[in-house]
Interface confidence: low
């Protein structure tokens, strides 16, 4: 049924597990997938007492709840682990927390990194 | 990778004491850093940890020892503190340290507080 | 805070035996789970991260499954030195938190 229309190749990588992972930290992520299915990117975080703490980012295997998402907007009210996703390249650098019951936005930026890719 | 483990001994209720953990074989600054306790004959129990700078060095505690037990690290020396105020009977246990917070891969051998008039 | 209940609290079972010890949460947190081997008088152990993958060094009769909030640790075939104390703990949500434990003795 095709890539629709803001098609995902890569997207910004990031798994603060990655010691025990065995992965890189940080760097851009190449998404595979399977043809005829849609690719995306996805963030996950933490808020501890305002302290914005990175859990992981990377590519998303076809997801309906993504289709669309040109923002990676997290809509749960109070989760303990944040999570959104979104269709574009790299469009999961930036994430926004925006409660489906209301409340104010709030809007994350990624420190300046220099990234590496991932193969 | 090496954890070694500092301080603990007899204490009297009420008083402070502090417990050291000094890293060696991998870069301190890089990693959350956790403590853990052990009661006699009994199971785990989770303390606190402190994040790396890279995360604000944040701090998280168990509620049975928030306000009274501090965790703080230098970097610079590769050492992560717990410092114990208030004691109590109940605070008696092996305390560990521990590298990481998602998963404690490294682990110091231990010390012994006892908390006892 | 989120309880972790460890089923059974002790077992015993014999060399070559297959053995699982179970883990639920008290309510979903997803794969952040760990599991611990502790032998009396040392430092635990971890043996299984996030819930399913196997910590370097560690025997691959070792195993973790679950999600969510029911978990298990497998040993597919027990050695002698396997007979410790196994914890799982949950890093979803501070206060982390230990399930009681699972003291495996032999029989």
């Known amino acids: 049924s095709g890539r629709g229309e803001a098609e995902t190749r890569e997207c910004i990588y990031y798994n603060a597990n990655w010691e025990l992972e065995r992965t890189n930290q940080s760097g851009l992520e190449r998404c595979e997938g399977e043809q005829d299915k849609r690719l995306h990117c996805y963030a996950s975080w933490r808020n501890s007492s305002g302290t914005i703490e990175l859990v992981k980012k990377g590519c998303w295997l076809d997801d309906f709840n993504c289709y669309d998402r040109q923002e990676c907007v997290a809509t749960e009210e109070n989760p303990q682990v944040y999570f959104c996703c979104c269709e574009g390249n790299f469009c999961n650098e930036r994430f926004t927390h925006l409660p489906e019951a209301g409340g104010p936005e709030v809007t994350y930026e990624p420190p300046p990194t220099a990234p590496t890719l991932l193969t | 990778m090496q954890l070694v483990q500092s301080g603990g001994g007899l204490v009297q209720p009420g008083r402070s004491l502090g417990l050291s953990c000094t890293a060696s074989g991998f870069t301190f600054g890089d990693y959350a850093m956790s403590w853990v306790r052990q009661a006699p004959g009994k199971g785990l129990e989770w303390v606190g940890f402190i994040r790396s700078k890279a995360y604000g060095g944040t701090t998280e505690y168990a509620a049975s020892v928030k306000g009274r037990l501090t965790i703080s690290r230098d970097d610079s020396k590769s050492i992560a503190y717990l410092q114990m105020n208030s004691l109590r009977a109940e605070d008696t246990a092996v305390y560990y340290c521990?590298?990481?917070?998602?998963?404690?891969?490294?682990w110091g051998q231990g010390t012994t507080v006892t908390v006892s008039s | 805070d989120i309880q972790m209940t460890q089923s059974p609290s002790s077992l015993s079972a014999s060399v070559g035996d297959r053995v699982t010890i179970t883990c639920r949460a008290s309510q979903n947190i997803s794969n952040f789970l760990n599991w611990y081997q502790q032998k009396p008088g040392k430092a635990p152990k971890l043996l299984i991260y996030?819930?399913?993958r196997l910590q370097r060094g560690v025997p691959s009769r070792f195993s973790g499954s679950g999600s969510g909030t029911d978990f298990t640790l497998t040993i597919s075939s027990l050695q002698p030195e396997d007979f410790a104390t196994y914890y799982c703990?949950?890093?979803?949500?501070?206060?982390?938190?230990f399930g009681q434990g699972t003291k495996l003795e032999i029989k």
């Open positions: 703990q949950q890093s979803y949500s501070t206060p982390y938190t």
């Open positions: 996030s819930a399913s």
């Open positions: 521990a590298r990481g917070h998602y998963g404690m891969d490294v």
